[in-house]
């Protein structure tokens, strides 16, 4: 087989992806309130509801239309601490529900791991990959018929998610960055981007960018625990701001934006 | 209702050239991969090459790859299969399917067929 | 490349009577999300292909009840609880694992 463009690494999809069992409950982040006063806003707010409501992660994603606009960078990060996994060799996890910042703003992607031997320090490593659909045309119009279906899907499969699991070979696949030690190298396409790896493995952006949406897998590789779920992903999202933001976004404050 | 139509098929000669068009209507084109499937007369179905909503990715059958070029314009609702250096195996109904969770194709045009013959 | 090979490649079957097509591949379909990339596809005489089950086991928007898809790993099959006439055709099982490959095809005909 042939592929072209960036779409490289693994061709059999998401990999590890959630590191949740399928049968698992879904864990929800919280809803939204709407505020509004004008349809605008209530637009908005529907589409925020689309992305977090309910099992499916459907709803907002990078788009040509967004690139117009103001953004704010929503983070949703589908592994949270209150999925609790069994003990295995090795364990990562996201943990934050979703995280808010304006474009070219600061934003982390939480990533802790945990091994059962640690004579070696592991490898960490933190992927993008761009979405198998595009979330904001769906998040924009939640009635649709392509809606219905992503419903009735997560319905029957709870935790599967159409935007995140596809073969990379339809997909853009990059290294963002990996840590060994204190030595964090950046992937290729990120060099010069002030990015790193802080902490246990988070990922920090001190300036987020239009084409970072999309779903950063972390995943720790040791020598010593072979076994366990060491991958879990994050999905970022940018998304053009409106009028409705404070609304869209309960107890958000928008600050300035910087060129 | 959801729906793809293909054209541009039809008869040619070994070593030239032909593009087929999807026309998709009904749902938010620019939100899922697509894909090209053909069937030769009297045989099974060989998936072709399939794009990425936003054109970026690309992925061909090695029977096709080099010789075959899948694209999409968003603006227009339509996919593209450009088919050079055509040989009579090529021959059979093209359809062109959208790209569905879990990687199926859930919705199919009625086909177009390319007669490779000189 | 994933191979997939079904059986039988002709399926007589009897209005009312169960019928069930397999489809076996050369490596395991199971992804480590815990999903079989395994699809059916009908196709009618004369007519495109129509999704039938995805993901192993989920019936598509529309289908029949009667369809039903199981299986894990290599094996999978798909059955048809009580086969009426309008299910005659082609049945096409296809992995969606690496790339996308088709098995041959089973002919379904009323005896």
């Known amino acids: 087989m042939q592929q072209d463009g960036l779409g490289v690494g693994t061709r059999n999809g998401s990999g590890k992806g959630r590191s949740v069992h399928p049968s698992w409950p879904w864990c929800a982040p919280r809803p939204l309130r709407y505020f509004g006063r004008d349809a605008r806003a209530r637009r908005a707010q529907t589409a925020a509801m689309a992305l977090l409501a309910g099992g499916l992660s459907r709803g907002l994603g990078s788009h040509p239309a967004a690139a117009g606009r103001d953004a704010v960078v929503f983070v949703w990060l589908l592994l949270s601490t209150w999925c609790t996994a069994p003990a295995r060799a090795i364990q990562v996890t996201v943990s934050n529900p979703y995280h808010v910042v304006i474009l070219f703003q600061p934003v982390t992607l939480p990533c802790t791991y945990q091994m059962t031997s640690t004579p070696t320090q592991p490898i960490v490593i933190w992927k993008y990959k761009s979405f198998c659909r595009d979330r904001i045309a769906d998040a924009f119009s939640p009635a649709s018929v392509d809606n219905q279906l992503n419903a009735q899907l997560a319905a029957g499969n709870p935790g599967y998610n159409p935007y995140v699991e596809c073969q990379d070979s339809v997909r853009t696949v990059r290294v963002v960055a990996t840590k060994q030690g204190n030595a964090v190298t950046l992937g290729d396409y990120y060099q010069g981007r002030r990015i790193t790896i802080t902490g246990n493995a988070d990922l920090t952006f001190d300036q987020t960018a239009w084409g970072d949406s999309g779903v950063y897998y972390c995943s720790v590789v040791s020598a010593q625990d072979l076994q366990g779920n060491n991958e879990a992903y994050a999905e970022l999202i940018v998304l053009g701001r409106t009028s409705g933001v404070a609304e869209l976004l309960p107890g958000f404050q928008a600050g300035p934006i910087e060129d | 209702q959801v729906q793809l139509v293909e054209s541009g098929g039809g008869v040619v000669q070994p070593g030239r050239s032909l593009r087929l068009s999807c026309a998709a209507s009904g749902f938010t084109f620019s939100s899922y991969a697509m894909h090209w499937v053909r069937q030769a007369p009297g045989k099974g179905l060989e998936w072709v090459a399939v794009?990425?909503?936003?054109?970026?990715?690309?992925y061909y059958a090695d029977s096709v790859k080099g010789r075959f070029t899948i694209s999409r314009d968003n603006s227009k609702n339509t996919l593209y299969l450009q088919m050079n250096s055509l040989r009579a195996e090529d021959t059979a109904v093209y359809y062109c399917?959208?790209?569905?969770?879990?990687?199926?194709?859930?919705?199919w045009g009625q086909g177009t067929m390319v007669t490779v013959s000189s | 490349d994933v191979v997939m090979t079904q059986s039988p490649l002709s399926l007589p079957v009897t209005p009312g009577e169960p019928a069930s097509v397999s489809c076996k591949s050369s490596?395991?379909?199971?992804?480590?999300?815990?999903?079989?990339?395994l699809d059916w596809y009908l196709q009618k005489p004369g007519q495109s292909p129509q999704l039938l089950i995805y993901l192993g086991s989920n019936r598509a928007s529309g289908v029949p009840d009667r369809f039903s898809g199981s299986g894990s790993g290599t094996d999978f099959t798909l059955k048809i609880s009580r086969v009426e006439a309008e299910d005659v055709g082609v049945y096409y099982c296809?992995?969606?694992?690496?790339?996308?490959?088709f098995g041959q095809g089973t002919k379904v005909d009323i005896k």
């Open positions: 794009i990425s909503y936003d054109g970026s990715n690309k």
């Open positions: 296809m992995q969606a694992l690496e790339s996308w490959t």
């Open positions: 399917a959208r790209d569905s969770p879990g990687n199926a194709f859930d919705i």
């Open positions: 490596q395991s379909l199971l992804r480590s999300n815990g999903y079989n990339y």
